[in-house]
């Protein structure tokens, strides 16, 4: 199949990093500067992504692969491929329209991004609070008093945290 295809379409012989140049009798020409082709047989090369301003270059563009951006220090990426940058806050805070604000009592955030989430309600599982929660950490639930018999497990890990939402700029 490959041989048949190459007989029919000379462009299929052009490797990644080149394009099939119609202006030059379908010769394989190297991708021009600031462009790339990640697969063979391309009739054009794609423009490289540019990382400027709040974005910084994580991976340089090459003739065969696109540039990759991430955010400058103090920011984190939002969206697939880092399409936007959002300011970091400290643990124990969340980003609001008025900037980074401490988590309200009864909530916590153990990351530099995302929203403050309510402490786990141990009593819903019939357990008691073993370690109090803080702005930065969830409570740790322990066994209920009735479970405190020899050989009983002493600590239950907290419920898994929900995926943090995207908080306002």
């Amino acid at each position: 199949f490959e041989r048949t295809r190459s007989l029919q379409d000379p462009c299929s012989n052009c490797p990644a990093g080149t394009f099939c140049d119609n202006n030059r009798n379908q010769i394989c020409s190297p991708c021009p500067p600031n462009s790339f082709s990640s697969a063979g047989g391309q009739r054009t090369c794609d423009i490289c992504r540019q990382c400027k301003g709040v974005f910084r270059t994580r991976k340089e563009c090459s003739s065969t692969s696109n540039a990759e951006c991430d955010c400058t220090p103090g920011f984190h990426c939002l969206g697939a491929g880092c399409s936007m940058c959002e300011q970091d806050c400290k643990q124990g805070q969340e980003l609001t329209k008025k900037g980074c604000k401490d988590c309200c009592f009864g909530t916590f955030n153990d990351q530099k991004r995302g929203i403050c989430r309510p402490w786990t309600n141990c009593s819903l599982d019939g357990k008691s609070v073993l370690v109090n929660g803080t702005k930065e950490r969830d409570v740790v639930c322990g066994p209920s008093p009735a479970d405190l018999s020899p050989g009983a497990s002493s600590v239950t890990p907290p419920a898994p945290a929900r995926e943090p939402g995207h908080s306002p700029q």
Partner: antibody, heavy 115, light 107 residues
């Protein structure tokens, strides 16, 4: 709260220099850059250029010979200067914070170029 | 520069209907397309970033899709406040560019 506000003369004579300022609050000028974007009456949006948090600039090639964007951190202001203006430069001029997708804009200021 | 072409130029629909707006790029821009809503006398407002991510506070009737050169903004059920001009913009390569806009008007 993040706020940007453009200001400057609403009327500029042809061949003169248009000067606008973008006064910001709610964020640090050393952390964020700003873009300038304009919109002629009844038309679409056109990117003029940007100044980054480190002070370097990028301009649209269509304006590069007559545009200057600068920052005055002491006044919390960015500025745009566009020289040798013509009637075609009549537009609403916006500044927008650099976050990768223009989430925060000023309200815009209309500049009319006329003698 | 990358040219973004929006269609249709004007879309006439009634509240409750579904709106589909198109944006085509002259080059591959990955998923680095944003959508903005603009009402008369106001600045544009970010709706969608990264082709499909709803920005904070944007109702879930707004959704974006696409990658490469073809992008779509869908408003699933039009509310009276949705009638406005919509722009797509690319943040992939400089100079940053915008489409010419689609006017969404009440039928």
């Amino acid at each position: 709260q993040v706020q940007l506000q453009e200001s400057g003369p609403g009327l500029v004579k042809p061949s003169e220099t248009l000067s606008l300022t973008c006064t910001v609050s709610g964020f640090s000028l050393t952390t964020y850059g700003v873009h300038w974007i304009r919109q002629p009456p009844g038309k679409g949006l056109e990117w003029i250029g940007a100044i980054w948090s480190g002070g370097s600039t990028d301009y649209n090639a269509a304006f590069i010979s007559r545009v200057t964007i600068s920052v005055d951190t002491s006044k919390n202001q960015f500025s745009l200067k566009l020289s040798s203006v013509t009637a075609a430069d009549t537009a609403v001029y916006y500044c927008a914070r650099d976050d990768g997708s223009f989430a925060n804009w000023g309200q815009g200021t209309l500049v009319t170029v006329s003698s | 520069e990358i040219v973004l072409t929006q269609s249709p130029g004007t879309l006439s629909l009634s509240p409750g209907e579904r709106a589909t707006l198109s944006c085509k790029a002259s080059e591959n821009v990955g998923t680095y397309v944003s959508w903005y809503q603009q009402k008369p006398g106001q600045a544009p407002r970010l709706l969608i970033y990264g082709a499909s991510n709803r920005y904070t506070g944007i109702p879930d009737r707004f959704s974006g899709s696409g990658s490469g050169t073809d992008f779509t903004l869908t408003i699933s059920r039009l509310e009276p406040e949705d009638f406005a001009v919509y722009y797509c913009g690319q943040t992939y390569s400089y100079p940053l560019t915008f489409g010419q806009g689609t006017r969404l008007e009440i039928k």
